[in-house]
């Protein structure tokens, strides 16, 4: 059977939404009203990996696009990117590790930890209109907590 994928949107803990910024970058900013239609809809796939009640391995693709969030080393630093894939082969149950995030939910906080780089998290800046990135610190200035809104396919 193919991997199960569900559509969702994400907002950071300051209620910033995620939108496309150019072809291969996401940025976070506050949206209201009709502007909410700009927000990215993810296709979240439940993939193979170590799982617990609080931690579920997922891949985050962009709905109806052959783009996935992935974590790679750039200049020796773990980096978040949007990677183009062959739509005939993705999504799949056994995703390469760079595409896998541990969706961790504890006490109303939802984090996305890179499976490739433990303790590195999908992050946003406090400032408006800044890129979504992979951050190596929790509880600092940068935001690593999100809420998730599932949407009908």
């Amino acid at each position: 059977a193919p991997v199960r994928s569900l559509n969702c949107t994400l907002r950071d803990s300051q209620q910033k939404s995620l939108v496309m910024s150019g072809p291969y970058e996401l940025k976070a900013l506050h949206l209201q009203g009709q502007d909410m239609e700009q927000q990215v809809v993810f296709s979240m796939s439940f993939v193979q990996g170590e799982e617990s009640n609080d931690k579920i391995p997922v891949a985050l693709g962009l709905k109806e696009k052959n783009l996935y969030l992935s974590c790679v080393l750039k200049d020796d630093k773990p980096t978040l990117q949007l990677e183009s894939v062959d739509p005939k082969n993705y999504p799949k149950k056994k995703m390469e590790k760079r595409f896998v995030f541990n969706k961790i939910e504890i006490n109303n906080k939802l984090e996305f930890e890179s499976a490739q780089f433990p303790n590195w998290y999908i992050s946003t800046s406090q400032a408006e209109n800044m890129p979504v990135f992979l951050g190596g610190t929790k509880g600092g200035q940068d935001i690593t907590d999100f809420t998730m809104q599932f949407v009908s396919s």
Partner: antibody, heavy 119, light 107 residues
Framework: EVQLVESGGGVVQPGRSLRLSCSAS????????MSWVRQAPGKGLEWVAY????????YYPDSVKGRFTISRDNSKNTLFLQMDSLRAEDTAVYFC????????????WGQGTPVTVSS | DIQMTQSPSSLSASVGDRVTITCRAS??????LTWYQQTPGKAPKLLIY???TLASGVPSRFSGSSSGTDYTLTISSLQPEDIATYYC?????????FGQGTKLQIT
Amino acid sequence: EVQLVESGGGVVQPGRSLRLSCSASGFIFSRYDMSWVRQAPGKGLEWVAYISHGGAGTYYPDSVKGRFTISRDNSKNTLFLQMDSLRAEDTAVYFCARGGVYKGYFDLWGQGTPVTVSS
Amino acid sequence: DIQMTQSPSSLSASVGDRVTITCRASGNIYHYLTWYQQTPGKAPKLLIYNAKTLASGVPSRFSGSSSGTDYTLTISSLQPEDIATYYCQHFWKLPYTFGQGTKLQIT
């Protein structure tokens, strides 16, 4: 005993609001995703709201999106459904159920609380 | 949305009979299917999930199977306490939807 007990149902006029509660006991509430499922008189079942175990994830079908809000208080083992701008078609028995988006099915149900929307 | 169509909508059978209820999905749901039993005036009860896995405490006379997009609930030997309405529900894509129900009566 493992159980869910709903309360808060009643008769309400169209356009008004109602808040349902569901009290959980006999299991570790904070470890489970929860949902509300409704059943109109003589009809089938419709899933109307979901919240993840910590409260960070939600889902609403188009029929109630923007009108219903699900929430939970894990310290009090309680699930809520705030229903605003109620319509006649929201008349139903509302069940609290354990389960949701990830697991996909509902393995424990409450007895239901009836909501009637009528002028 | 994926539509779930149950058949028959109602049926009568005798104690000891083998009973089958079918649920047809409007698209492929890859065994992400659940069956519930709802006795009159009560809450639904989980019977089967993942198309064929029996829920805890459910008698072994209940079983689930599938062929393509058709899913079947079978009661091998009908008992008086099985009088109920049976619902299927898929959980492949959102929204997860239920069938319209099959009302089972004893003749």
